[in-house]
């Protein structure tokens, strides 16, 4: 049975085996086409999600589709039902929390009272000014809190207590990529992890440990990527894995927060990377122990210089490393998080690509998660 499962796939009606390599090859080899059913699927960017959260105290903003203008949500008459609608619009299914936060003198966007219409937030047309003088601070999910804060050093062994959202993504029980838990059903990783194997069956997720081999595997229901853009072949290196069964959160299994839409990190901002990847470029082996390192944002202009990536780093990517080199993500770290800590930990980047590992002029290049929030929300909504 194990051998059969490893090398063959069972088609139904009529029952017969086909070689596993014929799974997800674009050809219907089973009469009912089930060999092409459980494959990595692409999902378009989709329409603009009409709600978003700002780094200014996680305040809620709503889009007026008629004008294309964004507005801050006034706390006047805001209810739990409206909070749930806002979070559902972003694809969250968990129970949100919200509170009033005072409008600051530098409030830029106009402030409006919010209502609901066909499961979407809208501006209340007949409303008056924002009398409470408060905005809605909304949290759709408790995220980004760990039991232990890492120390700021170069590279060191990591504890799952520090990074409870880190997972190992494995194919045929072999670690291929890292990933991050975003909510009980979803793991964030890189699309290029699935280039070789596009069937969902043999992919598994392992969560809750910092040792590679020691924790139970979780079945995967779906793997979703963005449609390929031939104009920018390295763009869109992002994937979402939907787990077959929701995770139960604990001290060692917790979600990391998505970034805010306006999370603009300036050069030299401190960030963290983690992974079980190669400790030496072009060789060595995977690390059995999770490793962590502190890095910093590297200016995109510097990153695109002639002695570096020569313009290959697009607006949907970011660079991180240390100016003198030597600390970087490497093979096997792909898909793992590039993390920023404010009040909570946020996954601002996904380990994507780079030339070599740890070179001074070629730092790691990461998928900029804030550029894909709309896509993430649309995927989640479609799967609610």
């Amino acid at each position: 049975k194990v051998i059969l499962d490893k090398y063959y796939f069972l088609c139904g009606q009529p029952l017969h085996f086909i070689p596993r390599k014929q799974l997800c090859d674009g050809e219907l080899d089973c009469p009912l086409g089930e060999d092409e059913e459980h494959c990595v699927k692409s999902f378009p960017e989709g329409p603009a999600v009409a709600v978003r959260l700002s780094k200014d105290r996680s305040t809620l903003q709503v889009l007026d589709s008629a004008t294309g203008n964004w507005f801050s949500a006034c706390f006047d008459n805001f209810t739990e039902a409206l909070a749930e609608t806002a979070c559902r619009q972003m694809g969250y299914s968990s129970k949100p929390t919200f509170r009033a936060v005072e409008i600051g003198p530098d409030q830029d966007l106009d402030v409006v009272e919010i209502t609901e219409n066909s499961q979407e937030l809208r501006m209340r047309n007949s409303s008056g000014p924002c009398l409470s003088g408060s905005l809605v601070s909304l949290h759709c999910l408790a995220c980004g809190k760990s039991l232990k804060t890492p120390r700021v050093v170069g590279v060191e062994e990591a504890s799952v207590d520090s990074w409870p959202w880190q997972v190992s993504i494995q194919y045929d029980k072999q670690h291929v990529c890292g990933g991050s838990i975003l909510d009980p059903h979803w793991v964030l990783t890189a699309a290029h992890c699935f280039r070789k194997h596009t069937d969902v069956f043999n992919w598994k997720v392992r969560a809750g440990s910092d040792k590679l081999g020691s924790f139970p595997s979780l079945a995967v229901a779906k793997i979703i990527i963005i449609e390929f853009n031939p104009m920018y072949p390295k763009d869109n290196d992002i994937a979402l894995m939907k787990l077959q069964f929701p995770l139960t959160f604990s001290g060692t299994v917790r979600p990391i927060c998505l970034p805010f839409f306006d999370e603009e990190l300036t050069p030299a901002t401190p960030l963290w990377i983690i992974g079980w990847g190669f400790t030496k470029q072009n060789g060595g082996k995977m690390s059995d122990i999770l490793l962590q390192a502190s890095v910093q944002v590297i200016d995109s202009t510097r990153c695109n210089a002639d002695d570096a990536y020569q313009g290959e780093v697009t607006e949907k990517m970011m660079c991180a490393g240390i100016p003198e080199g030597g600390v970087d993500t490497c093979q096997g770290d792909s898909g793992g998080p590039l993390m920023y800590q404010s009040d909570q930990w946020h996954v601002v980047g996904i380990v994507s690509w780079g030339y070599g590992c740890g070179g001074p002029s070629t730092p790691g290049v990461y998928t900029k998660v804030s550029a894909y929030l709309n896509w993430i929300y649309n995927v989640w909504k479609a799967e609610l």
Epitope: I103, P105, D106, V111, S127, G128, P129, G133
Partner: antibody, heavy 121, light 107 residues
Framework: QVQLVQSGAEVKKPGASVKVSCKAS????????MHWVRQAPGQGLEWMGW????????NYAQKFQGRVTMTRDTSTSTVYMELSSLRSEDTAVYYC??????????????WGQGTLVTVSS | DIQMTQSPSSLSASVGDRVTITCRAS??????LAWYQQKPGKAPKLLIY???SLQSGVPSRFSGSGSGTDFTLTISSLQPEDFATYYC?????????FGQGTKVEIK
Amino acid sequence: QVQLVQSGAEVKKPGASVKVSCKASGYTFSRYFMHWVRQAPGQGLEWMGWINPNSGGTNYAQKFQGRVTMTRDTSTSTVYMELSSLRSEDTAVYYCARVRIGWLQSPPLYWGQGTLVTVSS
Amino acid sequence: DIQMTQSPSSLSASVGDRVTITCRASQSISTWLAWYQQKPGKAPKLLIYAASSLQSGVPSRFSGSGSGTDFTLTISSLQPEDFATYYCQQSYGFPWTFGQGTKVEIK
């Protein structure tokens, strides 16, 4: 675009009252507080009070309490400022001014063209 | 009431000069401060809000700084159209109060 059009100049006798209008257009009238600010000839700016066009609620500077009344007519998107018991020192240009965004402490961004009220016997 | 004191009350400058106007509040107003420009016979125009946020459409040569009680409006390179009177205004508490104004004249 946002426009605030005020009524024309007035000449009044001491003790009389004056009512200045300010007609708003180009935005949702009920959503933004309207302030009144005056400026005596060659002098600085002086805040008089505000009105909430949605509810009609008002707040006046202590100095004008009892003499000033701010009202609104939602059907015509117009606010009014009436000042009674006029004295010569009330001679000034009176401005209505709409806040930048829809809450109270936002500074005025849009201003009417001003209405000169002259109090003279 | 919160008193707002501007200095100088007037200044003479040439085109291209860097001009600085200060405004002091009688108590802390955080950054609840706006700056206006007014030309003769015209309504005031909002330049800066929240002490340092540039109002959309205002040239970037205007900048504001400060918090608490001391604030500054700077014009980095004075242009012919900048000759006017400038007012600061606090919206920390009612009644709102304005500075007495600073008149910027051609030298």
